[in-house]
Amino acid sequence: APARLICDSRVLERYILEAKEAENVTMGCAEGCSLGENITVPDTKVNFHHWKKSEAGRHAVEVWQGLALLSEAMLRSQALLANSSQLPETLQVHVDKAVSGLRSLTSLLRALGVQKEAVSPPEAASSAAPLRTVAADTLCKLFRIYSNFLRGKLKLYTGEACRRGDR
């Protein structure tokens, strides 16, 4: 992926739009489309001042780990959907899109250097508090977390990283 493609705001906005679309679709289905189990996902809440005041290395860890956890969660839901006959096929399309989107975002962030920043210097990773997580038991909640993660931590991190790259 071109190193700074993620710095074009339209790129991230496209993924955010896809995530919101999926969230809206799943809001309409019975019980938010139950997954039948609890899937661990990153907590997407942001104390804005705390985020802005903590170091970039810590942000990188949070975003990189969060993205990995979300990717695992989406793959797990994909597997659960494949084994379910109750859920409409259109949902499968949204999950597939999200899986593909998370792969692309991971590549885009790797190109931006988030992976390097997340592991070096080592003290950044060790001093970072363990990633806060929550449980998602419906597709609706999973897509909401996905959408919030992109709109919140991911967008904040890429904004900072892209600004640093401009200097």
Partner: antibody, heavy 117, light 108 residues
Framework: EVQLVQSGAEVKKPGESLKISCKGS????????IGWVRQMPGKGLEWMGW????????RYSPSFQGQVTISADKSISTAYLQWSSLKASDTAMYYC??????????WGQGTLVTVSS | SYVLTQPPSVSVAPGKTARITCSGD??????AYWYQQKPGQAPVLVIY???KRPSGIPERFSGSNSGNTATLTISRVEAGDEADYYC??????????FGGGTKLTVLG
């Protein structure tokens, strides 16, 4: 002890300009942001904006963007809120507050601004 | 822009539990903050990050936040708790939004 001391009450005429101040002491001024909050007579709190004195980053509430200017002088640990042309509807109590991970954890005593012809 | 809605007033007898609610679209996805303001005074932060208490705030004050609603709970209410209470939240963009405020009246 953390203290935010605001400038005194002001009585102004419509169309006049004004700059009120908020001086921080008892803490590292550049390690925290300063937020400004409006409270019109008998009404609730309205967030106007915040400034990071260290990076000079400012964010305005959409409702106040273009209506006021927020600034800071870190050399004297002071934040400012100013108007270029006051309106009668700007009559209110204006509070500054320190913004930390515990947002708006310390407040100034407030500056009452009265705009009347 | 994001809107937080609070009931204009809540009444409670001394010694009882007061619950003040704050609702906003998917508020549970954001941190909630609560402030107490007594007449003629500046506001005071009583709860931050949904449920944490700043030092000096009594344990009687607690907070929760899920779905579309954040709740400030004041147990064993005292006459001195009578005040206006405001909820607030950070948006992902860095805006800080206050609710309209709730007047807590302690009866008797």
């Amino acid at each position: 002890e953390v203290q935010l001391v605001q400038s005194g009450a002001e009585v102004k005429k419509p169309g006049e300009s004004l700059k009120i101040s908020c001086k921080g002491s008892g803490y590292s001024f550049t390690s925290y942001w300063i937020g400004w909050v409006r409270q019109m007579p008998g009404k609730g709190l309205e967030w106007m904006g915040w400034i990071d004195p260290y990076r000079s980053e400012i964010r305005y509430s959409p409702s106040f963007q273009g209506q006021v200017t927020i600034s800071a002088d870190k050399s004297i640990s002071t934040a400012y809120l100013q108007w270029s042309s006051l309106k009668a509807s700007d009559t209110a109590m204006y509070y500054c507050a320190r913004v930390s991970s515990e947002p708006f954890d310390s407040w100034g005593q407030g500056t009452l601004v009265t705009v009347s012809s | 822009s994001y809107v937080l809605t609070q009931p204009p007033s809540v009444s409670v007898a001394p010694g009882k539990t007061a619950r003040i609610t704050c609702s906003g679209d998917k508020l549970g996805d954001h941190y909630a903050y609560w402030y107490q303001q007594k007449p003629g005074q500046a506001p005071v932060l009583v709860i931050y990050d949904d449920s944490k208490r700043p030092s000096g705030i009594p344990e009687r004050f607690s907070g929760s936040n899920s779905g579309n609603t954040a709740t400030l709970t004041i147990s064993r209410v005292e006459a001195g708790d009578e005040a206006d209470y405001y909820c607030a939240t950070w948006t992902f963009e860095g805006d800080y939004v206050f609710g309209g405020g709730t007047k807590l009246t302690v009866l008797g």
